[in-house]
C-alpha cells in the first residue's frame, strides 16, 4: 500500500494509472467503500462522500490512462485509505494528513516560549524535527517547546514530520518582538548632549503600546522614572517627564531620547520598557551612560569617570603625542604638578579609545583652559 503525506490546508494529488493509455472507467472510493468520484464517458461524476465539494480529478490526463484524485483544503479527518478501481484492479493509497500550528500568536516577545503542536491522524506515530532560523535543531513528538526565545529565533522555522519513512515539511514564520540591542552604552564628556536610541528589531503595520524609562544613577540610592510615553500607530507622545533631567523624545520610531547635558549625577544605568497592546509581558532595553570630567585644581590635574565601566577599562592621563603619564584600572586618575600643554584624558578598552577629554594646562601663572 502506497503512503502519501499531506499538509492540513494544502492540496494533495493521489495517482491512479491504468495499463491502457486511454480513457476508461474508474472510481475512487474511501475505506468505507463510499464513492468519492469517477467518470461516465468524458464526464466527472461525484459520489455522496464528505469530500464532495473538495474532490476533483484532471480530465486532461484521462486519455493517457491517468485518473488522479485531487483533494483540496486538506483536513486531518481526510486521513484514510483511498481505493482507485480501474480495469478490474484496485490501487490503494493511504493518505495521512498532518497539521503544525504555533500554540499562540506567531508574534512573540523575546524571552517567551514557543510551542508547536502537531495535529495527526489517529493511529499514526510521527516524529517531528524543527530547525530554527539560527540553525538550532529541536526534536519531539506531538508537541515541541522552545523556551526563552531570542532575537535570532525570528524568521522561518522549518519543521519536518516523518512517518513511514515519508516526510512532509512545514514552514512557520515566527516574529520575535524585541529591541535590536539588549544593552547599549553611551560614553560622553561632561556637558555634551546625549542621544539614546532604542531601535526595534521588527516591523509591524500598527504598533501601539506604552513605555517608560527608569534610571538608576550611580550616585543615587534608588531608581526613578525619567519619562513615560504612549505609542499609537508608531506615533510617540510623552505622558510625563521629570524636571531634572528634562528629557526630550522624538515623535516617531525608532524611540529616541535626548538628554541636554551629560553630567556626573546622571551617569548610571537605565531600563526602557515597552508594553505592546494585546501582548502580555514587556520589551526591555538596558542603556548605560558613562560621563568623563577632566579638571585642574591648583597643582592637581584630575580625570574622573562616572557610570557603569568595566574593570577591563584603563583610564589614562597623557600629554598630547606622548606616552601616558598615568594609566590605571580606576575611575579616577591624577597628575601632580602637570607640565604645560594639551593633556588628554582617555578611557580605553585594549587600546580602543571609548572616551576622550582634553584640557589645556597653562604655565603656572595662569588658569587652565577647557577646550
Amino acid at each position: 500500500k502506497k503512503v502519501v503525506l499531506g499538509k492540513k490546508g494544502d492540496t494533495v494529488e493521489l495517482t491512479c494509472t491504468a495499463s491502457q493509455k486511454k480513457s476508461i472507467q474508474f472510481h475512487w472510493k474511501n475505506s468505507n467503500q463510499i464513492k468519492i468520484l469517477g467518470n461516465q464517458g468524458s464526464f466527472l461524476t461525484k459520489g455522496p462522500s464528505k469530500l464532495n465539494d473538495r474532490a476533483d480529478s484532471r480530465r486532461s490526463l484521462w486519455d493517457q490512462g491517468n485518473f488522479p484524485l485531487i483533494i483540496k483544503n486538506l483536513k486531518i479527518e481526510d486521513s484514510d485509505t483511498y481505493i482507485c478501481e480501474v480495469e478490474d484492479q484496485k490501487e490503494e493509497v493511504q493518505l495521512l494528513v498532518f497539521g503544525l500550528t504555533a500554540n499562540s500568536d506567531t508574534h512573540l516577545l523575546q524571552g517567551q516560549s514557543l510551542t508547536l503542536t502537531l495535529e495527526s491522524p489517529p493511529g499514526s506515530s510521527p516524529s517531528v524535527q524543527c530547525r530554527s532560523p539560527r540553525g538550532k535543531n529541536i526534536q519531539g513528538g506531538k508537541t515541541l517547546s522552545v523556551s526563552q526565545l531570542e532575537l535570532q529565533d525570528s524568521g522561518t522555522w522549518t519543521c519536518t514530520v516523518l512517518q513511514n519513512q515519508k516526510k512532509v515539511e512545514f514552514k512557520i514564520d515566527i516574529v520575535v518582538l524585541a529591541f535590536q540591542k539588549a544593552s547599549s552604552i553611551v560614553y560622553k564628556k561632561e556637558g555634551e548632549q546625549v542621544e539614546f536610541s532604542f531601535p526595534l528589531a521588527f516591523t509591524v503595520e500598527k504598533l501601539t503600546g506604552s513605555g517608560e524609562l527608569w534610571w538608576q544613577a550611580e550616585r543615587a540610592s534608588s531608581s526613578k522614572s525619567w519619562i513615560t510615553f504612549d505609542l499609537k500607530n508608531k506615533e510617540v507622545s510623552v505622558k510625563r517627564v521629570t524636571q531634572d533631567p528634562k528629557l526630550q523624545m522624538g515623535k516617531k520610531l525608532p524611540l529616541h531620547l535626548t538628554l541636554p547635558q551629560a553630567l556626573p549625577q546622571y551617569a548610571g544605568s537605565g531600563n526602557l520598557t515597552l508594553a505592546l497592546e494585546a501582548k502580555t509581558g514587556k520589551l526591555h532595553q538596558e542603556v548605560n551612560l558613562v560621563v568623563m570630567r577632566a579638571t585642574q585644581l591648583q597643582k592637581n590635574l584630575t580625570c574622573e569617570v562616572w557610570g557603569p565601566t568595566s574593570p577591563k577599562l584603563m583610564l589614562s592621563l597623557k600629554l598630547e603625542n606622548k606616552e601616558a603619564k598615568v594609566s590605571k584600572r580606576e575611575k579616577a586618575v591624577w597628575v601632580l604638578n602637570p607640565e604645560a600643554g594639551m593633556w588628554q584624558c582617555l578611557l580605553s578598552d585594549s587600546g580602543q579609545v571609548l572616551l576622550e577629554s582634553n584640557i589645556k594646562v597653562l604655565p603656572t601663572w595662569s588658569t587652565p583652559v577647557q577646550p
Partner: antibody, heavy 119, light 113 residues
Framework: QVQLVQSGAEVKKPGASVKVSCKAS????????INWVRQAPGQGLEWMGW????????GYAQKFQGRVTMTRDTSTSTVYMELSSLRSEDTAVYYC????????????WGQGTTVTVSS | DIVMTQSPDSLAVSLGERATINCKSS????????????LAWYQQKPGQPPKLLIY???TRQSGVPDRFSGSGSGTDFTLTISSLQAEDVAVYYC?????????FGQGTKLEIK
C-alpha cells in the same frame, strides 16, 4: 581559542634592527590587545608594550620608547614587533602574549623567538 | 612604575609539603573603583613560555590543579602550593596588570628538597 605562532630565531649585530612576527591561528584576533614580553637569558620577564590588532593603536613602555614599533597585517592576522638600535643587552627570548578576556593577565603565549645580538 | 618584589629568590620543599611564595608591590594593585586586585601568578618551566596559574590574585585559571591557590590584597600577595608534586618544579612569577607599564616580580625558583 587563539594560538600564537612566532617567527624563528634571529642573530643580529649591534645597531641593527630585528622584526619579530606573531601570527594568530584558530580564532582570529578579537578586540583585545597583543602584548610583547621579553626575557633575557636567566633573567625575569619584562613587558614591552601592546598593540590592538583590530585598530592599530599601540602603547609602549617608557624604556623602549623610540626604539620599538608594533605593526600589524590584518589580512594575515599577524602582529610585528620591531626593535631598532640593538645592543647586547637586547639578547632575549621575545614573546607575544594575549589575554582572551581582555584584562591583561596573559593566558595565551607564543612559543618565543630568540634574538641574539652579537658582534 | 610599580615595582614587584618576590621572596624568597629560591625555595626547596619536600614532595607532598606546602610551598609558599610571596610577592610585594611598591604601590597597591587593588583598584578602589572595582574592588579587585590586578595581580597574576605564572609558572615557567625550562625552555617553555610562562603559564598563567592565578588571576585577580586568587582566581585559578581553568585547568590549573586545585593545589595552587592565591591570596592577599593591596600590596602583599601569596602563592601557595598545598602539596608539592614533582611537576611543580619551575620558576614562579607575579605580575601586576593594574597600571602600565605592567611589571613582573624577579621570579622564585622552586626545587625539590
Amino acid at each position: 581559542q587563539v594560538q600564537l605562532v612566532q617567527s624563528g630565531a634571529e642573530v643580529k649585530k649591534p645597531g641593527a634592527s630585528v622584526k619579530v612576527s606573531c601570527k594568530a591561528s584558530g580564532d582570529t584576533f578579537s578586540d583585545h590587545a597583543i602584548n610583547w614580553v621579553r626575557q633575557a637569558p636567566g633573567q625575569g620577564l619584562e613587558w614591552m608594550g601592546w598593540m590592538n590588532p583590530k585598530i592599530g593603536n599601540t602603547g609602549y613602555a617608557q624604556k623602549f620608547q623610540g626604539r620599538v614599533t608594533m605593526t600589524r597585517d590584518t589580512s594575515t592576522s599577524t602582529v610585528y614587533m620591531e626593535l631598532s638600535s640593538l645592543r647586547s643587552e637586547d639578547t632575549a627570548v621575545y614573546y607575544c602574549v594575549y589575554d582572551s578576556s581582555g584584562y591583561d593577565a596573559f593566558d595565551i603565549w607564543g612559543q618565543g623567538t630568540t634574538v641574539t645580538v652579537s658582534s | 612604575d610599580i615595582v614587584m618584589t618576590q621572596s624568597p629568590d629560591s625555595l626547596a620543599v619536600s614532595l607532598g609539603e606546602r610551598a609558599t611564595i610571596n610577592c610585594k608591590s611598591s604601590q597597591s594593585v587593588l583598584s578602589t573603583s572595582y574592588n579587585r586586585n590586578f595581580l597574576a601568578w605564572y609558572q615557567q618551566k625550562p625552555g617553555q613560555p610562562p603559564k598563567l596559574l592565578i588571576y585577580w590574585a586568587s582566581t585559578r585559571q581553568s585547568g590549573v590543579p586545585d593545589r595552587f591557590s592565591g591570596s592577599g590584597s593591596g600590596t602583599d600577595f601569596t602563592l601557595t602550593i598545598s602539596s608539592l608534586q614533582a611537576e611543580d618544579v619551575a620558576v614562579y612569577y607575579c605580575q601586576q596588570y593594574y597600571s602600565t607599564p605592567y611589571t613582573f616580580g624577579q621570579g622564585t625558583k622552586l626545587e625539590i628538597k
